[in-house]
Amino acid sequence: PGPPPGSPRASPDPRAELDSTVLLTRSLLEDTRQLTIQLKDKFPADGDHNLDSLPTLAMSAGALGALQLPSVLTRLRADLLSYLRHVQWLRRAMGSSLKTLEPELGTLQTRLDRLLRRLQLLMSRLALPQLPPDPPAPPLAPPSSTWGGIRAAHAILGGLHLTLDWAVRGLLLLKTRL
């Protein structure tokens, strides 16, 4: 029958809530790692690849030790929204060129979306301040060439991989303090 009307909802266990978010993050990290390996195998590209529209990496020396849960979740959600947008853009702009990676890219997009929903839920359950809706971002310009798109794919997956590592490390570290 559930709790009587008007009674407060049982407060969630923050460790358990955080834990399930970490698991989704690790799962997405593993998907990203596998896809990065495939991309490097099928479309080798040496050196560091950058894309100006990608978020700057959220961590810096010493920053992990001083993290607070609200700032981690807020920053992670903002960065992952940007990566979701970039993955969607990549699939649209490079559909034919990256056909061999398409099922995996689609799965990555779905799981990224799921993690974003999970973060939103976690923030509301932990009664963290909700962010105002993001202003619409300017559309991403199509890549100038197939090679430009492949370099963009390397930058997007490489950046997402590092961001998810930061997230797993930060969230697990915060979990030890709860």
């Epitope: 799962s27 991989h161 590092l162 590592d165 797993v168 979990k175």
Partner: antibody, heavy 119, light 111 residues
């Protein structure tokens, strides 16, 4: 060939500090975390902490927080671990190890650096 | 912290025999498709060497006679047919939470 080469053995007095280096070669240094593990005689292996070379962001086992400092020099593909306020229980072999991002399993290890703390 | 207990502490077997090493965690280290347990081999005077990662994946360059299994709290490293070079100490390690911790080791000796 993927390799991690550590600096040589150290003998230190109690209260002193030691800084160990770990030079990586044969792979892209920023694609993996660098972890540090302690092996004291007759004790379990113990994880000290890790650092992401891309950002220089370290995390530590609470047991070593405040005494261990992890740093990297990206241009030299080298990681460092400094341990301060040394005591006799710090006598051990210290290893650097390459860690897969987000997973903490270690697929390449340095040869180890023996640190002896003795008055 | 999660505590890993390995058994037996030591094991004496002959080349050609099958070795079964156990690792038990104080709480589950498995979740949605992954088990965060890894196995290492260490010989005297050498660094540990990764054998198995994420419970059952064979690390690069490791012979197929090594295999890992298990989920939840109970894990096993199996060496199907022992060779001379397999006599060493074996450690399990988890990475389910921070900090990652190691078992106390199982020493595999020649009978």
């Amino acid at each position: 060939e993927v390799q991690l080469v550590q600096s040589g053995a150290e003998v230190k007095k109690p209260g002193a500090s030691v800084k160990i280096s770990c030079k990586a070669s044969g792979y892209t240094f920023t694609d993996y975390n660098m972890d540090w593990v302690k092996q004291a005689p007759g004790q379990r292996l113990e994880w000290i902490g890790d650092i992401n070379p891309h950002s220089g962001g370290p995390i530590y086992n609470q047991k070593f927080t405040g005494r261990a400092t992890l740093t990297v020099d990206k241009s030299a593909s080298t990681a460092y671990m400094e341990l301060s306020s040394l005591r006799s229980e710090d006598t051990a072999v210290y290893y650097c190890a390459r860690g897969e991002l987000g997973h903490w399993y270690f697929d390449v290890w340095g040869q180890g650096t023996t640190v002896t703390v003795s008055s | 912290d999660i505590v890993l207990t390995q058994s037996p502490a030591s094991l004496a077997l002959s080349p050609g025999e099958r070795a079964t090493l156990s690792c038990r965690a104080s709480k589950s280290v498995s979740t949605s498709g992954y088990s965060y347990i890894h196995w290492y081999q260490q010989k005297p005077g050498q660094a540990p060497r990764l054998l198995i990662y994420l419970a059952s994946n064979l690390a690069s360059g490791v012979p197929a006679r090594f295999s890992g299994s298990g989920s939840g709290t109970d894990f096993t490293l199996t060496i199907s047919s022992l060779e001379e070079e397999d006599f060493a100490t074996y450690y399990c390690q988890h990475s389910r939470d921070l900090p990652p911790t190691f078992g106390q080791g199982t020493k595999l000796e020649i009978k």
